[in-house]
């Protein structure tokens, strides 16, 4: 094949090589950019900056090599449009530093930076960590800082990410209140800070105030939905990023719902309880306190991480006619109490009924939780018919 006279020439089915001396000063408008998986650039002294716009449209890029060129600066967001990048070789350029943000979000198997006049500072603490942890092939490069010795020997005691403290109100927060949160940021070289409020949705009206080093956040007219929602303060410096999440507990009274009994492996009287703080529960059977046993007990489903409502069952293992009756669930917290009742009829007397026999009741309780484990069974007979009346 005839030699390629262009600044950049195809290499394989989805590669591009740009090696003609001084032909590039940016990477705009590379031919066939959208399908490129490999880009090799060499001897480009005028290519000094690599920025976000340079790699736009290179979404399939996996290998990027820029060597023996004039690269002095790589923007922190330079690789935003190349999320599949796995090999990055920037050796023998003029780089003094490279931000941790540049490689954040990439899954780099290889990062080559040898032959650059690196300047040892806290901004390279992340790279020193890669070297310590054996990541990206960095240890094999024995990276040096220009006139300062090995990167591995750089003192790092003062190189920490920002320290965050979020102050939340001590006092009880009620529905409708306004809540002021303050995030105190400490650390060297603070660059940016802010709040992440994606979970809040309709839980409150949000107003931000202040700036580094003290950020304020007012949550106005809070609702009970604010419970279990993360409010996150973040801050960044040249070493890295820190985040602290807090939750605001909004007090509200207990509430309870009961549903018709259902037969599964066992019988279940489904319930839902809500309230903040979490309510204590008690069951009554025909008006008397129900003592929980391995045959009748409260079982909670796994709670959703971001809500206060708890769902569960009063679980009955092989109930008989003596378990027919009125079940009441009482829920109480310091802000109120609630109850709900339901009639359950599991079966007629399977043992022959004598009107003079006493009907026993099981009595006294505790709030409980969990998931199944009956013996694997073979049934010779079908169960008795059941009827359930809603009270």
């Amino acid at each position: 094949a005839a030699p390629c006279p262009d600044a950049c020439c195809p290499h394989g089915s989805s590669g591009l090589r740009c090696t003609r001396d001084g032909a590039l000063d940016s990477l705009h408008h590379l031919p066939g950019a959208e399908n490129l998986t490999e880009l090799y650039i060499e001897n480009q002294q005028h290519l000094q900056h690599l920025e976000l716009r340079d790699l736009r449209g290179l979404g399939e890029l996996r290998n990027l090599t820029i060597v023996k060129s004039g690269l002095r600066f790589v923007a922190p967001d330079a690789f935003h449009f190349t999320p599949r990048l796995s090999r990055l070789n920037l050796s023998f350029n003029a780089l003094e530093s490279l931000s941790w943000k540049t490689v954040q979000g990439l899954s780099l198997q290889e990062l080559v930076l040898s032959g650059n006049p690196l300047h040892c500072s806290c901004a390279l603490r992340w790279l020193q960590r890669w070297e310590e942890e054996g990541l990206g092939g960095v240890p094999e490069q024995k990276l040096q800082c220009h006139g300062q010795g090995p990167l591995a020997h750089m003192p790092n005691a003062s190189c920490g990410v920002p320290t965050l403290k979020v102050q939340v109100p001590n006092a009880s927060v009620d529905v409708g209140d306004d809540v002021l949160l303050r995030c105190q940021v400490e650390g060297r070289g603070l660059e940016q800070a802010g709040w992440i409020l994606t979970e809040l949705e309709q839980s409150a009206t949000v107003m931000k105030s202040g700036g580094l080093p003290s950020l304020g956040l007012t949550l106005a007219n809070v609702t009970s939905d604010l419970n279990r929602k993360n409010v996150t303060c973040w801050a960044e410096n040249d070493v890295g990023r820190a985040e602290v999440s807090v939750q605001v507990n909004v007090s509200f009274p207990a509430s309870v719902q009961l549903h018709t009994a259902v037969e599964m492996h066992h019988w279940c009287i489904p319930f839902s309880v809500d309230g903040q703080p979490a309510p204590s529960l008690r069951w009554l059977f025909n008006g008397s306190v129900l003592n929980e046993t391995s045959f009748i007990f409260t079982e909670f489903l796994e709670p959703a991480a971001n809500e206060t409502v708890r769902h569960g069952c009063l679980r009955l293992n092989q109930p008989t006619h003596v378990n027919n009756g009125n079940y009441t669930l009482l829920a109480a917290n310091p802000f109120g109490q609630a109850s709900a009742s339901i009639m359950a009829a599991f079966m007629d007397n399977p043992f022959e009924f004598n009107p003079e026999d006493p009907i026993p009741v099981s009595f006294s309780p505790v709030d409980t939780n969990s998931t199944s484990g009956d013996p694997v069974e073979k049934k010779d007979e079908t169960p008795f018919g059941v009827s359930v009346a809603v009270g």
Epitope: T293, F295, I359, N369, P375
Partner: antibody, heavy 115, light 108 residues
Framework: EVQLQESGPGLVKPSGTLSLTCAVS?????????WTWVRQPPGKGLEWIGE???????NYNPSLKSRVTISVDKSKNQFSLKLSSVTAADTAVYYC????????WGQGTLVTVSS | SSELTQDPAVSVALGQTVRITCQGD??????ASWYQQKPGQAPVLVIY???NRPSGIPDRFSGSSSGNTASLTITGAQAEDEADYYC???????????FGGGTKLTVL
């Protein structure tokens, strides 16, 4: 499948406290099952001692209630039995099992009360 | 009363049917479970609830209940069925469990 294993001293002095532990493997003690202790004096029948749920609910045999404590340690996936003020009548093979059906049992451990 | 009563001993000819009974007031209210115990071994659950057999238990074992009596029936007894059999159920109060005194089954 679930397996249970009792452990503890085989000899306890009269008036002392019998302490046994049941390690649960092949399943979580925090499942929807209760866990129980049963004993069997030599040559005699089975006697239910008590049961516990991982959230702390417990029930005891009324005849032993004043002397029995059953507890659960979720972090170790085990539950325990303490029986105080023992006498020779408490000499028995002690079993742990899964309630309510007692569908899984430990192999049992003989505890002798003797000075 | 919080008692379950069993016959101390029962015998059956090989291949014949035998019924082991358990009596008590609690059985008017609750199902019995049945356990088989061979010398030096832990008991094994054979029937629970309303005639449920755990997996691995042969179908010659079955349970039934009437009035204050629960029964374990072995249809076509085998030599390996020779063992002690215990019933248990919830006590009448529902708050604790009780065992019968056990029945020694001999297969002739």
């Amino acid at each position: 499948e679930v397996q249970l294993q009792e452990s503890g001293p085989g000899l306890v002095k009269p008036s002392g406290t019998l302490s046994l532990t049941c390690a649960v493997s092949g399943g979580s003690i925090s499942s929807s099952n209760w866990w129980t202790w049963v004993r069997q004096p030599p040559g005699k029948g089975l006697e239910w001692i008590g049961e516990i749920y991982h959230r702390g609910n417990r029930n005891y045999n009324p005849s032993l209630k004043s002397r029995v404590t059953i507890s659960v340690d979720k972090s170790k996936n085990q539950f325990s039995l303490k029986l105080s003020s023992v006498t020779a009548a408490d000499t028995a093979v002690y079993y742990c099992a899964r309630a309510p059906w007692f569908d899984y049992w430990g192999q049992g451990t003989l505890v002798t009360v003797s000075s | 009363s919080s008692e379950l009563t069993q016959d101390p001993a029962v015998s059956v000819a090989l291949g014949q049917t035998v019924r082991i009974t358990c009596q008590g007031d609690a059985l008017r209210s609750y199902y019995a479970s049945w356990y088989q115990q061979k010398p030096g071994q832990a008991p094994v659950l054979v029937i629970y609830g309303k005639n449920n057999r755990p997996s691995g238990i042969p179908d010659r074992f079955s349970g039934s209940s009437s009035g204050n009596t629960a029964s374990l029936t072995i249809t076509g007894a085998q030599a390996e069925d020779e063992a002690d059999y215990y019933c248990n159920s919830q006590a009448s109060s529902g708050n604790h469990l009780i065992f019968g005194g056990g029945t020694k089954l001999t297969v002739l």
